[in-house]
């Protein structure tokens, strides 16, 4: 099952071009920008999604304190280099030969340098903290109901096994979702927490990546959960390497 056979579309990625030219006339979908074939039964990697986005027309209770090594994606959008599996290449460069090293979610983890910059390996982001602030409601959400609904959402919509949702914290109006996935834990076929977090982020912003589905309608016991702010922190298996001048 790679794509919807009846009308040849990609349910998990609307930024694709699909045609029935696969083996035996099966529907096959390729990501915009890279032209890489994607598996439409699961989430597309963040690298291919970013590449597609850059190629598209422009109109198109106890809270966790992020550690000193937590990264926030301050650089925003760029046109990434992806490897043949669709993962981010460890070294990214722009058109002006400025280069930097990224982690597995594509967030810069070193100072910028020139073409001589070396990035020996793609460092895995093993812990993601999604920090949400919800709009005022009549009362606080029940913590266990919120936990259950968010776990259900990540399992059913983003195909992430709940064992990778380490915790859901709630201190009204702040919700924190902790995703954790060590290299040793991730089996073949498991959705990467970085990809799940990216799909969730785009859903929350009203920019769903899913084909022809309604946007995200998050409800806890029937009460709408409307998010007004999102901040995502990324923690890598190896701490990032920035010079002191960045910290001042």
């Amino acid at each position: 099952h790679t794509a919807a056979q009846d009308n040849c579309t990609c349910p998990t990625n609307k930024m694709t071009v699909c045609s029935p030219d696969g083996p035996g006339g099966r529907c096959q979908c390729r990501a915009l920008g890279s032209g890489m074939a994607v598996d439409c039964s699961t989430l597309t990697s963040k690298c291919l999604l970013l590449k597609a986005r850059m190629s598209a027309p422009k109109n198109a209770r106890t809270l966790v304190r992020p550690s000193e090594h937590a990264l926030v994606d301050n650089d925003g959008l760029y046109d990434p280099d992806c490897d043949p599996e669709g993962r981010f290449k460890a070294r990214q460069c722009n058109q002006t030969s400025v280069c930097w090293c990224v982690n597995s979610v594509g967030v810069r983890r070193t100072d910028k340098g020139d073409l001589s910059l070396r990035c020996d390996e793609l460092v895995r982001t093993h812990h993601i903290l999604i920090d949400l602030r919800h709009r005022p409601t009549a009362g606080a959400f029940n913590h266990s109901d919120l936990d259950a609904e968010l776990r259900r959402l990540f399992r059913e919509r983003y195909r992430l096994h709940p064992k990778f949702v380490a915790a859901v914290h709630y201190e009204q109006p702040t919700i924190q979702i902790e995703l954790r996935q060590n290299t040793s834990q991730k089996a073949a076929g498991d959705v990467d927490i970085g990809d799940a977090a990216y799909y969730f982020e785009r859903d929350i912003k009203g920019e769903s990546l899913f084909q022809g589905r309604g946007g995200l309608d998050l409800r806890v016991r029937g009460e709408p959960l409307q998010v007004e702010r999102t901040l995502i922190y990324y923690l890598d298996e190896i701490p990032p390497k920035f010079s002191m001048k960045r910290l001042t």
Epitope: A148, R151, R152, E156, R157, P162, K163, A167
Partner: antibody, heavy 119, light 111 residues
Framework: QVQLVQSGAEVKKPGASVKVSCKAS????????INWVRQAPGQGLEWMGV????????SYNQKFKGRVTMTTDTSTSTAYMELRSLRSDDTAVYYC????????????WGQGTMVTVSS | DIVMTQSPDSLAVSLGERATINCRVS??????????MHWYQQKPGQPPKLLIY???NLESGVPDRFSGSGSGTDFTLTISSLQAEDVAVYYC?????????FGQGTKLEIK
Amino acid sequence: QVQLVQSGAEVKKPGASVKVSCKASGYTFTDYSINWVRQAPGQGLEWMGVISTYYGDASYNQKFKGRVTMTTDTSTSTAYMELRSLRSDDTAVYYCARYGDGYNQFDYWGQGTMVTVSS
Amino acid sequence: DIVMTQSPDSLAVSLGERATINCRVSESVDSYGNNFMHWYQQKPGQPPKLLIYRASNLESGVPDRFSGSGSGTDFTLTISSLQAEDVAVYYCQQSYEDPYTFGQGTKLEIK
């Protein structure tokens, strides 16, 4: 209230196929995946696989791969499990069970469908 | 596959007494403090019924004489004061890893 109602008992010959249905009500069908579990007479429970009602694709227990197909019809909120090349040791009660909210527990079960394989 | 071993296979307890069923798992089902272990009750001619999820959480509507404990590889289901309606077969189940597996079952009877 949440209900899973399964189709009636079946008697099949060895080598034949059987298709069991599971009609859901009382909740949004596409919000929860459906699992299939079987129980041979006097024996324990055996997980066969799970189908995503949202995406329509399934993950099967390796033991049944190639013989089982799980499908859904969202227009009628019904899940189906088809088992092919039946053998006498496939005689069992077949249950559908819904995933619970947070931890992949099975919170609601169908009443079961008895499938007897006999020549 | 993860193997679940329940003990004992059968158990006879007097009404009002405590009943304890154990489940040992071949590998840990703990993920960041969340144990993907559940307990079900099955009465003759009926489907299983969820009692406990995530090792120790009581399912809605289940009497509080039922409780679950344990983590990692060793888990326990306890009925604090046995009632006549508790006569059934009890199963543990892991949902940490596909294929999901069940224990062989423990038959609980009244002494």
